[in-house]
């Protein structure tokens, strides 16, 4: 396994309607035609895998069904966007890349990305 | 230029197994997935899986779960789709499809699963 | 699953006509994609990433939408474009197909 350099930024607010997209980029030594993206988040020291795609050669990134994230690729960037956030979910979100195929299997790890999420204030009432 | 040829037809009765080819050329085999659709007839498209030629890494559709199993050949630039246990519900015409975005189709397998 | 449902199943139009056909899926994805198919051939990728036309394809088609609604037009028809149209998604696994809509002439 080698080790290979991944970058995210450091925070991301996400919006009034719980979405939250940042990009990931990785250092690839080779050409890969086989490239898995997995989403962590580590909160509490807990780390935990949100969601996780594997693509070949094309821009969409495709998930498992129910899955909160949606991505596209080009070149050696990621576009992750998570969805369905609420305040409780706050937390260091880190961008996993593993370069699977041709080998040598590559590995890296970005610092995170700390997502903020905000619940909306519900409405006032009105008299209006 | 790209071609995919598939396997001939096949009859095959109830319970039985039928096992597709689709030989890839004119491409590097393990740069694009391998899918592979189904068409039963008068009837729309239907996914079946997928497979990453150079890994193996597969995903297929729940639909199909313990029925359906792909494999591939580097050596001879093949993939295999194998169905067992068939029914008369799975007569149709499998298909191969190459990337993600099915840019190129193989000519269709017709399996027909009759008793 | 998310499911696509394109609208109509079934459309009579002449040569000329512009004509649109819609994609709604049950749940938002990044792009949908469409694909042509003749009588006894395999499909053929028209459009993808929703609004990119494939190699080779007459500028007469056209994609648009986002989120949950996507269309495709032909804006007018000719004669070898009388066929069967299918959406597809793959935002998430399994990937999936629309219904297909019949292109008739009138």
């Known amino acids: 396994c080698k080790a290979m350099h991944v970058a995210q930024p450091a925070v991301v607010l996400a919006s009034s309607r719980g979405i939250a997209s940042f990009v990931c980029e990785y250092a690839s030594p080779g050409k890969a035609t086989e490239v898995r993206v997995t989403v962590l988040r580590q909160a509490d020291s807990q780390v935990t895998e949100v969601c996780a795609a594997t693509y070949m050669m094309g821009n969409e990134l495709t998930f498992l069904d129910d899955s909160i994230c949606t991505g596209t690729s080009s070149g050696n960037q990621v576009n992750l966007t998570i969805q369905g956030l609420r305040a409780m979910d706050t937390g260091l979100y880190i961008c996993k890349v593993e370069l699977m195929y041709p080998p040598p299997y590559y590995l890296g790890i970005g610092n995170g990305t700390q997502i903020y999420v905000i619940d909306p204030e519900p409405c006032p009432d009105s008299d209006f | 230029q790209v071609q995919l040829v598939q396997s001939g037809a096949e009859v095959k009765k109830p319970g039985a197994s039928v096992k597709v080819s689709c030989k890839a050329s004119g491409y590097t085999f393990t740069s694009y997935w391998i899918n592979w659709v189904r068409q039963a007839p008068g009837q729309g498209l239907e996914w079946m899986g997928r497979i990453a030629p150079g890994s193996g890494t597969t995903y297929y559709n729940e639909m199909f779960t313990g029925r359906v199993t792909l494999t591939r050949d580097t050596s001879t630039s093949t993939a295999y789709i194998e169905l067992s246990s068939l029914r008369s519900e799975d007569t149709a015409v499998y298909f191969c499809?190459?990337?993600?975005?099915?840019?190129?189709w193989g000519q269709g397998t017709m399996v027909t699963v009759s008793s | 699953d998310i499911q696509l449902t394109q609208s109509p199943s079934f459309l009579s139009a002449s040569v000329g006509d512009r004509v649109t056909i819609t994609c709604s899926a049950s749940k938002s994805v990044s792009y949908i994609h469409w694909y042509q198919q003749k009588p006894g051939k395999a499909p053929k990728l028209l459009i993808y990433d929703t609004s990119t036309l494939a190699s080779g394809v007459p500028s007469r088609f056209s994609g648009s939408g986002s989120g949950t609604e996507f269309t495709l037009t032909i804006s007018s028809l000719q004669p070898e474009d009388f066929a069967t149209y299918y959406c597809q998604q793959r935002t998430t696994y399994p990937l999936t197909f629309g219904q297909g809509t019949k292109l008739e002439i009138k």
């Open positions: 499809a190459i990337g993600d975005y099915f840019d190129y």
